[in-house]
């Protein structure tokens, strides 16, 4: 389980001097301190999530380290960089016309990030084009301070969006999960997430990733037909990264799509999830926001079964445990819900076929003057193998034409005394949404399907 | 199928207020879409005079911001535009539409479904 | 508010021909363009959205592209039921505005 060496810093950030990646493109960073470079790595990974206001779990529940602690604490820790891929920012209640206490965190985010421009650290954002929240001027007021700010513009280039939402912050720290820069992602959205820590390796590959995105946000950007092989990757499924982390013997690795935006060695997400699915033996528990076995916003619809037959077969042919955790909000497709039926219409316990649908309803209570809230956003699997934690919902469109990244970590189970493993946490964090009086069977959901808490 | 209806007087006096109505069948308007209001002139422009949302929030164009409402009646499956003080310039064919899809993450919003139109003449 | 301008109002182009309808807007509106068609009888119809998308039942002949402000509507073979009045309209911010319309006839 020894930490591997590091590629060389130059292929996979180009810090030292303004460095052309084709069309002009480079980042203009800093260089980093030697001995920040030669510090060794002591990963650790921390699962962060945020829980919406008044949605009270059981007293003892489990919960992750709070979203919007983490990201200030990461913004705490950067002295040279902060890269943020997202897919929109809307950090202050004004974007969406709202005035409401619960923007706080989210503006203080934004403080922050101003801050950390005022101390030379440099900020560079790769977002959407098409984007939502398309009055927000979070991104004009960074700029004007200096941010780098790069619209990558999906919707020409792939006919998707830049759905990814991470940070790498001096190519030794990162943020992934489900929440884009948005303060209700901060107090009225559940998301979950992981922070890694001091985990230049990892770092510098996801980095990799940012570059994609980066080099195609300069005016007239084509994809190319093959990337240049200072992108490459060589931490994948076949060759995860393979280190320590707080002692516990660990294997990572990113995933990204679509795949035109994935060079040599890159793992594509769909790849990623298929594996981590097909090598499940006992049970595979799912949390993603959207669950359509079709494409999603491109007409005609076309019909997409590829998790779906894994979903199936594993539960068919191997006897998993699937369960299944869809959200269900104001501004759900209510033509999701025929395909969940149908799902969970192959469990048949007499034949050990066991194949469970809920809903999670965050319940909206006094908080209905917030547009597109209150809801699990979530989009994480687990297994008693392998925890994989992802931006990108459950529908073709993610993986054939949207950005996404996702993360894969395995943990020796036993060898701590300390702590569960990373996807013993994660099985427990589902667990307790699952059991919880907010995740609903669908015959507990009224034909409607109008994602009203009932209480 | 969706469909959407618009109803209400051809003919109003300057000064008084206009009142339409939009009626929906085939969805619900607590669902998904802005519930809008377009009017066009004689001569073809169109203009867009405001929407009341899926959730009871209303927009409206800053040129009608002081004359117009949108409110609904969901018992009903309706929706409303008032618009005071009208003047001959206000004539138009009035036509109620649908935006969205407002669903999670779509960064696509068109007016999918229209209403066939209801001219209304402002005269004395 | 953002301005939308069709600058042809009318045209008139042969059965079969190839057809294209041009649209400006005052300012980069991001590819956030709809376009619409309505029939002589007042019936209003999506076609196109976000630039270069076919709405779902719009026939293959109609086809969009554009960036920044220019924009245009393309039908490639033209048949007598596409005599309409055709209208951009954007979506990047509110409100929503349209361009003037172009009528479109058969020679």
């Known amino acids: 389980w020894q930490v591997r060496c590091p590629p060389t810093w130059g292929q996979v950030q180009p810090r030292d001097v303004p460095r052309s990646w084709g069309h002009g493109s480079s980042l203009a960073l800093e260089p980093l301190e030697a001995e920040v470079r030669k510090q060794r790595d002591s990963c650790q990974l921390v699962l962060v999530e945020s829980i919406p206001q008044d949605l009270p779990f059981a007293a003892g529940s489990l919960s992750a380290q709070p979203l919007g602690q983490a990201w200030l604490q990461l913004l705490d820790t950067a002295q040279e960089s902060v890269h943020v891929a997202s897919y929109y920012w809307s950090l202050t209640g004004p974007d969406i016309g709202v005035n409401d206490s619960s923007s706080q965190l989210g503006e203080a985010l934004l403080q922050k990030l101003q801050q950390l421009l005022g101390r030379n650290i440099s900020l560079a954002v790769a977002t959407s084009s098409p984007t939502l929240a398309r009055k927000s001027t979070d991104l004009q007021v960074l700029a004007a301070r200096g941010a780098q700010v790069r619209r990558v513009p999906m919707g020409r280039l792939t006919r998707g969006v830049l759905h990814s939402k991470f940070w790498v912050v001096d190519g030794r720290h990162i943020y992934m999960g489900s929440a884009n820069m948005d303060w209700r992602s901060l107090t009225q959205v559940k998301e979950l997430g992981a922070v890694i820590y001091n985990c230049s390796h990892l770092a510098q590959d996801l980095e990799k990733t940012f570059q994609t995105y980066w080099v195609l946000g300069v005016p007239k950007a084509v994809l190319p037909k093959t990337w240049p092989q200072n992108f490459s990757s060589h931490i994948n499924r076949f060759q995860p990264f393979q280190g320590l982390f707080d002692g516990v013997p660990t294997t990572a690795y990113f995933s990204a799509s679509p795949p035109a935006l994935c060079p040599q060695g890159r793992t594509p997400d769909l790849e990623a999830l298929l594996a981590v699915m097909g090598s499940a033996q006992e049970f595979i528990y799912a949390s993603v926001m959207e669950y359509f076995p079709t494409t999603r916003f491109s007409h005609p619809r076309r019909y997409w079964p590829v998790l779906d037959n894994a979903l199936r077969a594993a539960a068919f042919s191997k006897g998993v445990r699937v369960r299944l955790l869809v959200s269900c909000g104001l501004n759900t497709d209510p033509t999701m819900f025929p395909y969940l039926r149908s799902l969970q219409a192959l469990s048949n316990p007499a034949a050990n076929v066991s194949v469970d649908v809920k809903v999670f309803i965050v319940p909206v209570g006094n908080h209905s003057n917030i547009p597109f809230s209150r809801v699990n956003h979530s989009k994480f699997m687990v297994t008693e193998k392998a925890a994989y934690i992802g931006t990108s919902n459950w529908s073709e469109d993610y993986f054939s034409s949207t950005t996404g990244v996702g993360l894969v970590v395995t943990q020796s189970p036993g060898a701590q005394p300390a702590g569960a493993t990373v996807q013993e946490q994660l099985r427990q964090l589902f667990e307790r949404d699952w059991s919880s009086r907010y995740a609903v069977g669908l015959d507990g959901q009224a034909p409607g399907q109008d994602c009203v808490w009932q209480g | 199928d969706v469909q959407l209806q618009e109803s209400g007087p051809g003919l109003v006096k300057p000064s008084q207020s206009l009142s339409l109505t939009c009626s929906v069948t085939g969805y619900s308007i607590t669902s998904h879409y802005y519930w809008t209001w377009i009017r066009q002139f004689p001569g073809n422009k169109l203009e867009w005079m405001?929407?009341?949302?899926?959730?009871?929030?209303?927009n409206y164009n800053p040129s009608l911001k002081n004359r117009i409402s949108i409110t609904r009646d969901t018992s009903k499956n309706q929706f409303f535009l008032k618009l005071n003080s009208v003047t001959t310039e206000d004539t138009a064919t009035y036509n109620c539409a649908r935006e969205g899809p407002l669903y999670y993450g779509n960064p696509y919003w068109y007016f999918d479904v229209w209403g066939a139109g209801t001219t209304v003449t402002v005269s004395s | 508010d953002i301005q939308m301008t069709q600058t042809t109002s009318s045209l008139s182009a042969s059965l079969g021909d190839r057809v294209t309808i041009s649209c400006r807007a005052s300012?980069?509106?991001?590819?956030?363009l709809n376009w619409y068609q309505q029939k002589p009888d007042g019936t209003v119809k999506l076609l196109i959205y976000y630039t270069s998308r076919l709405h779902s039942g719009v026939p293959s002949r109609f086809s969009g592209s554009g960036s920044g402000t220019d924009y245009s509507l393309t039908i490639s073979n033209l048949e007598q039921e596409d005599v309409a009045t055709y209208f951009c309209q954007q979506f990047n911010t509110l409100p929503r505005t349209f361009g003037g319309g172009t009528k479109l006839e058969i020679k």
């Open positions: 405001g929407y009341i949302s899926y959730d009871g929030s209303n």
């Open positions: 300012q980069d509106i991001d590819n956030y």
